[in-house]
């Protein structure tokens, strides 16, 4: 199980309007230039077999790889909003850096990389996906974590 | 086909007890939280509880004490104890697969039993 | 615990017709907001989640909208086949969980 006081976040992290609408901004806009719209990366595969104690888990699992691998190689892009945006959320990742699920996670990592493999097999157009769900990812790392 | 089939619905006196069960076919209860919700005559959907993946199991405030929520993932069935039963009891109830997508989804479902609680 | 409230309670309408349905929060659920569709003696079918996805096989002629505390449920040409009666329910996390799932108390769309 996770050592669930360190998967937690404070709900105030996702109650600030400015942040919170320029991530949906962000969002928006990297989704009109996606042209796949039958993936769909944060969806009920993503969660498959992932009790309630262990989403917060899985989700900085997902938001760290949208960090390093995504939004860092992608930083030049939708601005301004991205200068802003990834601040943010990686300050989420920071406050996340404690939590950590005792046992086995095999299952979680398993659908975490199918994600990963998914955005990596798109190319650049996976990263664009990736931001264009940025609005899942913060909906979804509150609802996991608070 | 995913499934989902309740039974053990009927007639019980105020005070008695009953369970209720969800046969479940085509995913695997390792894999899915399930929820129960009923519906008295006429009346809007109710949350009862859910018990998750890991066995958890969670129930609204005025359930807990009297309903409890179990499952036996090898016959592949989710049950809805309820004790102490009263006439407001009467309704239709309900199982629901809880299919989290970043947020909790309640699909499909399955047909419901009838429980009516009358002396 | 959050209180879903839907109006009309019920209404009545034409094949054709364009129907709006709102929900409204106590409090602010994001999008964190599902539609249902139930007809009688049936159980409810997922239409809408996440305010506005719609699930899958549900008609175009279904969306959804808003976020926060006020919400709409959208039939752009109503079938014959639509005239059910309609729940919202929402999901409040970080609260307990005994009050982590509200429906709303429905709507009736009704044969004009």
């Known amino acids: 199980a996770p050592i669930s006081s360190h998967c937690r976040l404070d709900k105030s992290n996702f109650q600030q309007p400015y942040i919170t609408n320029r991530t949906f901004m962000l969002a928006k806009e990297a989704s009109l230039a996606d042209n796949n719209t039958d993936v769909r990366l944060i969806g009920e595969k993503l969660f498959h077999g992932v009790s309630m104690s262990e989403r917060c888990y899985l989700m900085k699992q997902v938001l760290n790889f949208t960090l390093e691998e995504v939004l860092f190689p992608q930083s030049d892009r939708f601005q301004p909003y991205m200068q802003e945006v990834v601040p943010f959320l990686a300050r989420l990742s920071n406050r996340l850096s404690t939590c950590h699920i005792e046992g086995d996670d095999l299952h979680i990592q398993r659908n975490v990389q199918k994600l990963k493999d998914t955005v990596k097999k798109l190319g650049e157009s996976g990263e664009i996906k990736a931001i264009g769900e940025l609005d899942l990812l913060f909906m979804s790392l509150r609802n996991a974590c608070i | 086909e995913v499934q989902l089939v309740e039974s053990g619905g009927g007639l019980v006196q105020p005070g008695g007890s009953l369970r209720l069960s969800c046969a479940v076919s085509?995913?695997?209860?390792?894999?899915?939280?399930m929820i129960w919700v009923r519906q008295a005559p006429g009346k809007g959907l109710e949350w009862i509880g859910i018990i998750d993946i890991d066995g958890s199991t969670y129930y609204a405030s005025w359930a807990k004490g009297r309903f409890t929520i179990s499952r036996d993932s090898s016959k592949n069935t989710v049950y809805l104890q309820m004790n102490s039963l009263r006439a407001e009891d009467t309704a239709v109830y309900y199982c629901?697969?809880?299919?989290?997508?970043?947020?909790?989804?309640?699909?499909?479902w399955g047909q419901g039993t009838l429980v009516t609680v009358s002396s | 615990a959050v209180v879903l409230t839907q109006s009309p309670s019920s209404l009545s309408a034409s094949v054709g017709d364009r129907v709006t349905i709102t929900c409204q929060a106590s409090e602010d659920i994001y999008t964190n907001l599902a539609w249902y569709q139930q007809k009688p003696g049936k159980a409810p079918k997922l239409l809408i989640y996440w305010a506005s996805t719609l699930a899958s096989g549900v008609p175009s002629r279904f969306s959804g909208s808003g976020s926060g505390t006020d919400f709409t449920l959208t039939i752009s040409s109503l079938q014959p086949e639509d005239f059910a009666t309609y729940y919202c329910?929402?999901?409040?996390?970080?609260?307990?969980?005994?009050?982590?799932?509200?429906f709303g108390g429905g709507t009736k769309v009704e044969i004009k």
């Open positions: 629901a697969r809880d299919r989290f997508v970043g947020v909790d989804i309640f699909d499909p």
């Open positions: 329910q929402a999901c409040v996390y970080g609260n307990s969980a005994d009050s982590r799932y509200t």
């Open positions: 085509g995913f695997s209860l390792s894999s899915y939280a």
